[in-house]
Amino acid sequence: SGVFQLQLQEFINERGVLASGRPCEPGCRTFFRVCLKHFQAVVSPGPCTFGTVSTPVLGTNSFAVRDDSSGGGRNPLQLPFNFTWPGTFSLIIEAWHAPGDDLRPEALPPDALISKIAIQGSLAVGQNWLLDEQTSTLTRLRYSYRVICSDNYYGDNCSRLCKKRNDHFGHYVCQPDGNLSCLPGWTGEYCQQPICLSGCHEQNGYCSKPAECLCRPGWQGRLCNECIPHNGCRHGTCSTPWQCTCDEGWGGLFCDQDLNYCTHHSPCKNGATCSNSGQRSYTCTCRPGYTGVDCELELSECDSNPCRNGGSCKDQEDGYHCLCPPGYYGLHCEHSTLSCADSPCFNGGSCRERNQGANYACECPPNFTGSNCEKKVDRCTSNPCANGGQCLNRGPSRMCRCRPGFTGTYCELHVSDCARNPCAHGGTCHDLENGLMCTCPAGFSGRRCEVRTSIDACASSPCFNRATCYTDLSTDTFVCNCPYGFVGSRCEFPVGLPPSFPW
């Protein structure tokens, strides 16, 4: 669809005469009729296939035509067409004299024609005007013309429809050739596809408008490149959505079980050494001078009862001090001024002279101790139980009540599931958090390496001369079934050539 535009510029009829040569009275009141039709080698009368247009009276005799509307008419004249412009045309321009106000053809006398011009040729669509001038014996007409496309039509033939839009069906303007030019932020054949935020993950992100990045299920982050872990995942991460891969030191399906209580909680006090011993379980090894499950209790230096012979111990900032009873002296009241004559031994202890009677020693009955048998034996004072075990006095002896996971007289042994050698056939045993695991040697499998996995002894093709090989599952060895004419454990000897045995 387009418009053929004709711009009349000047008409000269100096003598004011009609085509017949007769003069107009009082002058030639001139109007024009235009006929546009398909190309004809010789322009002939007939239908104006591309359209017609008439002007009002534009002037008398000779005159210039203004570029705008004149007396209700328009200049340039518009001849619209609703088809593909063929590129060629024929044009007839007639100048007529209007004696009255009725310009219809049937109202005019036949000799009212002033002049008639006919042209034909090629004309491409374009903005530029073609200037032309046609002269007859009595008149001259100067005009220009062009073909332009109607709104929303583009291309060499005005055949390409393109209407700019910015809605759900597209976001574009039209180029001069009718191709779409997407508005910023849009792409695709019809500019319907938004350009997402730069860096938005191609698979995991999408957008409904430009510079947006909406995440698909299971993904998060500004660019939808971070997976969402499984709901409930505590100390874990993911590489694809809804996973939960535990961080170091955490276990359980939701990584909520602390396998490294020592590092995460630092329960041991006063410089003690912490050892993990299972889920939420640990053992503190105390430095000298401290005790308690977490080594939180400071041992008094008097707790070890360093004062002998009934001396009383006093804690001091830099140690302790023994107050000795009468008859004793020394740092620990270890020296006696008494002899056996003074009956220094208590609780039935027997006295023995030493250094020619200058000193003595008490031999104590069971359950009593001390230089003078003055102390009842408390076998738990030295904290003999390791790994947080509880010491119990049992008459003349003592025993340790161990925490779970420990054993031995003093709870010094970690319970090992591997101690009973559960892995068969030379399997290697590994202690795990709540059990054990066997690593089996070649040829064995199962939780305890108890299943013999047959080793294919025939895999190395040990039989010769097309013999058939069989694996003996009981010994993991092979047996060769020889074809006729061969003997030997590998069927390597032809019959008739006895093997040369070395014995």
């Epitope: 996973q243 939960c244 535990c246 955490w250 276990g251 399906l253 990584c255």
Partner: nanobody
């Protein structure tokens, strides 16, 4: 393709028992630990039990200790959860899951779940 299919759920009275099964395919069953977790409406999921690839290590949440038992039959590629002394608070969708490794550490694949309802 890894697949875990749970079965055995249903309606049971308080104090009753159920045995859930998890049939696995698409991977070497003996290589992976398998566990169970549950999710009640409007609550976070709770890991309740897991068994290592060898079957040597099992663990239970405090809420089910002494009542639930997990076991595996590597020949049948199946893990079982025997649930005894069931309580109304055990009502949930029960899911079978595997971390994709031998130890019970995380979740990589899960099944579609089976509904357990404990009600009188």
């Amino acid at each position: 393709e890894v697949q875990l299919v749970e079965s055995g759920g249903g309606l049971v009275q308080p104090g009753g028992s159920l045995r859930l099964s998890c049939a696995a395919s698409g991977f070497t069953f003996d290589d992976y630990a398998i566990g169970w977790f549950r999710q009640a409406p409007g609550k976070e999921p709770e890991g309740i039990s897991c068994i290592s690839s060898s079957g040597g290590i099992t663990y239970y949440a405090d809420s089910v200790k002494g009542r639930f038992t997990i076991s595996r039959d590597n020949a049948k590629n199946t893990v079982y959860l025997q649930m005894n002394s069931l309580k109304p608070e055990d009502t949930a969708v029960y899911y079978c899951a595997t971390p994709g490794i031998a130890a019970c550490r995380g979740i990589h694949y899960t099944g579609q779940g089976t509904q357990v309802t404990v009600s009188s």
